[in-house]
């Protein structure tokens, strides 16, 4: 806090307020300010061998103000504290200390972590993620039609990034296997990207099975396409319902 200092007026008679300048209410030639105007703080400033009274609009850094009916004075903060409201309530600690609930600590208490930027003890923040977004349309090489096995993806957002000691974020991407809509592609539909088509609920024929996301698991290989008769398809549908493997991107 910058202190605006009341200049002292040289006067022959102590305790005579007439002619005192700055924030002084009363002053003397030898001692400077003896008392201050309302809302100003009295402080002693050493000049050479003598102490001079000054009136400040706010206490200098490292001091706090205390009010009394006759005088407002500046008092030093605790040794480990740079700025404070009082001796029990520090607002900024000296280098090497961490601020927590108005106190300066060498180390942060359990359950809190040191923020070396603000030099404060802060709560450990764990990752928070949103609900999953809906599955994307089932596609195979960009097509949303045909008889081919494809993939569909869903994502969720990170709402709160974790702090240094916080729990890491769970996966934010999931991909699984599915069967592209069982209908022949129209001429205009060939190669049309899934995201360009309206999202539709899966048809009865669309079977879904979670598979590794090739982006997150480079080693995963594509399963060859198979033509299936109706009996095989029914059998697969039952199996697919029982599978729920999902591979995801971890943040």
């Amino acid at each position: 806090q910058n202190a605006s200092r009341g200049r002292r007026q040289r006067r022959m008679h102590p305790n005579v307020s007439q002619g005192c300048q700055g924030g002084c209410a009363t002053c003397s030639d030898y001692n400077g300010c003896l008392s201050c105007k309302p809302r100003l703080f009295f402080a002693l400033e050493r000049i050479g061998m003598k102490q001079i009274g000054v009136c400040l609009s706010s206490c200098p850094s490292g001091y706090y103000g205390t009010r009394y009916p006759d005088i407002n004075k500046c008092t030093k903060c605790k040794a480990d504290c740079d700025t404070c409201f009082n001796k029990n309530f520090c607002t900024k600690c000296k280098s090497g200390f961490y601020l927590h609930l108005g106190k300066c600590l060498d180390n942060c208490p359990e359950g809190l972590e040191a923020n070396n930027h603000t030099m404060e003890c802060v709560s450990i923040v764990h990752c928070e993620v949103s609900e999953w977004n809906p599955w994307s349309p089932c596609t195979k090489k960009g097509k949303t039609c045909g008889f081919k096995r494809g993939t569909e993806t869903r994502v969720r957002e990170i709402i709160q990034h974790p702090s240094a000691k916080g729990n890491l974020c769970p996966p934010t991407n999931e991909t699984r296997k599915c069967t592209v809509q069982r209908k022949k592609c129209q001429k205009g539909e060939r190669g049309k990207k899934g995201r360009e088509r309206k999202r539709k609920k899966p048809n009865k024929g669309e079977s879904k099975e979670a598979i590794p996301d090739s982006k997150s698991l480079e080693s995963s290989k594509e399963i060859p396409e198979q033509r299936e008769n109706k009996q095989q398809q029914k059998k697969r549908k039952v199996q697919d319902k029982q599978k729920s493997v999902s591979v995801s991107t971890v943040h």
Epitope: Q1, N2, S4, R39, F41, S57, S58, Y64, G65, T66, R67, Y68, N72, T75, T83, F85, N86, K87, N88, F89, T91, K92, L101, G102
Partner: antibody
Framework: QVQLVQSGAEVKKPGASVKVSCKAS????????FHWVRQAPGQGLEWIGY????????GYNQKFKNRVTMTRDTSTSTAYMELSRLRSEDTAVYYC??????????WGQGTTLTVSS | DIVLTQSPASLAVSLGQRATITCKAS??????????MNWYQQKPGQPPKLLIY???NLESGIPARFSGSGSGTDFTLTINPVEAEDVATYYC?????????FGAGTKLELK
């Protein structure tokens, strides 16, 4: 004389943010810390935090720490308090006050915030 | 946090009588010989107004019928004699520790 004039009433939806201002006059803006206190309807007073106008240092009640930000503009002698991720429980009158030697001696007129869907 | 318990929650006093409100802190609010306890008055639709600072000092411009006393954990606000304009809610507040806290308030009414 010292005067603190706050911005007008606000109505917000849950999840939104609000920024309340407090313009000071009648004294040197950087001389005293600014504090923010709130009062829910029919309830008592609750301290939110403070800012030193001289250097912008701020500190918050742990209860609000992850949702509140206090700033100031020395050129206009204005202090600001922003509260994010609002919920219905944040419906209250928000006051700014100057802090002089461990007490709140001047207060703004209050800003009513209503959080409702 | 320092919890401040005010009593009574409400008080009905006749004009000209004495009103006494107490505030009990969950731990001492004294340090280095100073008591970091303040009292405020709040009327409906208005911000609080400082009455007493440092437990017993009267804020300038406040009538002398208001007085404060106490130290450590027990503090008292006295209004004597009560006047019609004193109808309000009164709060104690400690500045000794982070976070700063207020009492729940005492509502003063006239009998």
């Amino acid at each position: 004389q010292v005067q603190l004039v706050q911005s007008g009433a606000e109505v917000k939806k849950p999840g939104a943010s609000v920024k309340v201002s407090c313009k000071a006059s009648g004294y040197t803006f950087t001389s005293y810390t600014f504090h923010w206190v709130r009062q829910a309807p029919g309830q008592g007073l609750e301290w939110i935090g403070y800012i030193y106008p001289s250097n912008g240092d701020s500190g918050y009640n742990q209860k609000f720490k992850n949702r509140v930000t206090m700033t100031r503009d020395t050129s206009t002698s204005t202090a600001y308090m922003e509260l994010s991720r609002l919920r219905s429980e944040d419906t209250a009158v928000y006051y700014c006050a100057t802090y002089f030697a461990n007490n709140f001696d001047y207060w703004g007129q209050g800003t009513t915030l209503t959080v409702s869907s | 946090d320092i919890v401040l318990t005010q009593s009574p929650a409400s008080l009905a006093v006749s004009l000209g009588q004495r009103a006494t409100i107490t505030c009990k802190a969950s731990q001492s609010v004294d340090y280095d010989g100073d008591s970091y306890m303040n009292w405020y008055q709040q009327k409906p639709g208005q911000p609080p107004k400082l009455l007493i600072y440092a437990a017993s000092n009267l804020e300038s411009g406040i009538p002398a019928r208001f007085s404060g006393s106490g130290s450590g954990t027990d503090f008292t606000l006295t209004i004597n004699p009560v006047e019609a304009e004193d109808v309000a809610t009164y709060y104690c507040q400690q500045s000794n520790e982070d976070p700063l806290t207020f009492g729940a308030g005492t509502k003063l009414e006239l009998k």
